[in-house]
Interface confidence: low
Amino acid sequence: SSSPTSSASSFSSSAPFLASAVSAQPPLPDQCPALCECSEAARTVKCVNRNLTEVPTDLPAYVRNLFLTGNQLAVLPAGAFARRPPLAELAALNLSGSRLDEVRAGAFEHLPSLRQLDLSHNPLADLSPFAFSGSNASVSAPSPLVELILNHIVPPEDERQNRSFEGMVVAALLAGRALQGLRRLELASNHFLYLPRDVLAQLPSLRHLDLSNNSLVSLTYVSFRNLTHLESLHLEDNALKVLHNGTLAELQGLPHIRVFLDNNPWVCDCHMADMVTWLKETEVVQGKDRLTCAYPEKMRNRVLLELNSADLDCDPILPPSLQTS
């Protein structure tokens, strides 16, 4: 077995008792912040599981990969990573599991090379609309972000602001059209009940979209038409009942798409006929032979691909005089 990721003998490690001095002077080339491990050869700094309450001020200018996972950061203020000279090479920033509940406007400003950002497993009760765009202009400077990982960022019910969590996240994704170059977006495990209809149209470069393990019931108002580069769409472990003709046609029209639909409670009644027909013909659904009915009870566990039109009936609607309670 190899050794664990969290301790690195090949990294130079700052002594825990050294205070990280805030200074206008640029850090020394080989300086490593207290409670961090640094490797100039790998251009990597790891400050992992150290209960840090703020981003170290004395990050080395060479850092390309920065791991700040498993800390207690709470808030990322504007310019949290702004340094003089700037962290011009920082390309991958992982802040997962650091108890962030607030990310303010401009938190990631002055990171000209930032390609990958992971904020997963933080209870983000307050994500500024301008967290990623940096400004409130209607059209912001393009963000360099290519991959944005926002899995399990939903806060506990009692910590949510009195507003739609979906709406808060989407506002940050769309502000200033800054994320036009985004290629990978992961939004798994966020209890999303719906996907605001305008979000995908404004992220035209997406290659990979992960919406798995949410609570999406329907895609009726979601358009995939503009996502001509989309390669994978993950919709596993949601609450989808059926995909309607418009959605099916849009998915079929995407040239590189692979769709993942496992573990949804498909309702196998007359409304499912179009989807069953499409599943039998399409090559875009991965593992389509595993899709099974959840409802009605008589259809439970039936394989969708094995159904025919005679199986897919809707109970007749009784006139009011014949209805029973």
Epitope: S1, S2, P4, T5, A42, R43, T44, R64, N65, A91, A92, R115, Q116, D118, S120, V146, E147, I149, N151, R183, R184, E186, H208, D210, S212, N213, E231, S232, H234, E236, D237, R258, F260, D262, N263, Q286, G287
Partner: antibody, heavy 121, light 107 residues
Framework: EVQLLESGGGLVQPGGSLRLSCAAS????????MSWVRRAPGKGLEWVSA????????YYADSVKGRFTISRDNSKNTLYLQMNSLRAEDTAVYYC??????????????WGQGTLVTVSS | DIQMTQSPSSLSASVGDRVTITCRAS??????LNWYQEKPGKAPKLLIY???SLQSGVPSRFSGSGSGTDFTLTISSLQPEDFATYYC?????????FGQGTKLEIK
């Protein structure tokens, strides 16, 4: 200490079936995606299959799709690979490995020692 | 699926040499590229993850670079224990393919 221990390998005839197991310990099993990788005699490593931490998502190499099934029992901290319709070209040492990070931004940081599967008449 | 092509397939070198192995992806994979070392009868071992990050416990003579489609594993000064087979692996696509391997032998 993280440990992965494969079992279930052996000699089987073409067309036969075998189930491999991988017992995991030393970490929170359900939090990690897991994978099976194999190395055939004289060949390189081949990624075979992977499964998400919850077991809700599974992935297969084209060479095994429809014949192999990956699964996991998180209550038993065990990963499985059910291999059906085995062929001579499935002969290999099979390793189970743990993914560190999400499936799409991951690397295999711990590996078992492997179990040998031989398909021959 | 994303194809990974390593070069060279085999390589002879001496202790103390600087060695470079390259890996090319059939499409851009950002920095989702890992390097593993395998020795006969042993389990593979992670060396480099995310293209350039050194795994814990791996000697600093190993380094990785590259992004997009072209990646490099460099061993700055070969040691006797480094003679092994090296593999790259992409985790950008939903199927995580390996390169065919580069066997590093003693000259």
């Amino acid at each position: 200490e993280v440990q992965l221990l494969e079992s279930g390998g052996g000699l089987v005839q073409p067309g036969g079936s075998l189930r491999l197991s991988c017992a995991a310990s030393g970490f929170t099993f359900s939090s990690y995606a897991m994978s099976w990788v194999r190395r055939a005699p004289g060949k390189g490593l081949e990624w075979v299959s992977a499964i998400s931490g919850s077991g809700g998502s599974t992935y297969y190499a084209d060479s095994v799709k429809g014949r192999f099934t990956i699964s996991r029992d998180n209550s038993k901290n065990t990963l499985y690979l059910q291999m059906n319709s085995l062929r001579a070209e499935d002969t290999a040492v099979y390793y189970c490995a743990r993914y560190y990070g999400g499936y799409y931004s991951a690397w295999m940081d711990y590996w078992g020692q492997g179990t040998l599967v031989t398909v021959s008449s | 699926d994303i194809q990974m092509t390593q070069s060279p397939s085999s390589l002879s070198a001496s202790v103390g040499d600087r060695v470079t192995i390259t890996c090319r992806a059939s499409q851009s994979i950002s920095s989702y590229l890992n390097w593993y070392q395998e020795k006969p009868g042993k389990a593979p071992k992670l060396l480099i993850y995310a293209a350039s990050s050194l795994q814990s416990g791996v000697p600093s003579r190993f380094s990785g670079s590259g992004s997009g489609t072209d990646f490099t594993l460099t061993i700055s000064s070969l040691q006797p224990e480094d003679f092994a087979t090296y593999y790259c692996q992409q985790t950008y696509g939903y199927l995580h393919t390996f390169g065919q391997g580069t066997k590093l032998e003693i000259k």
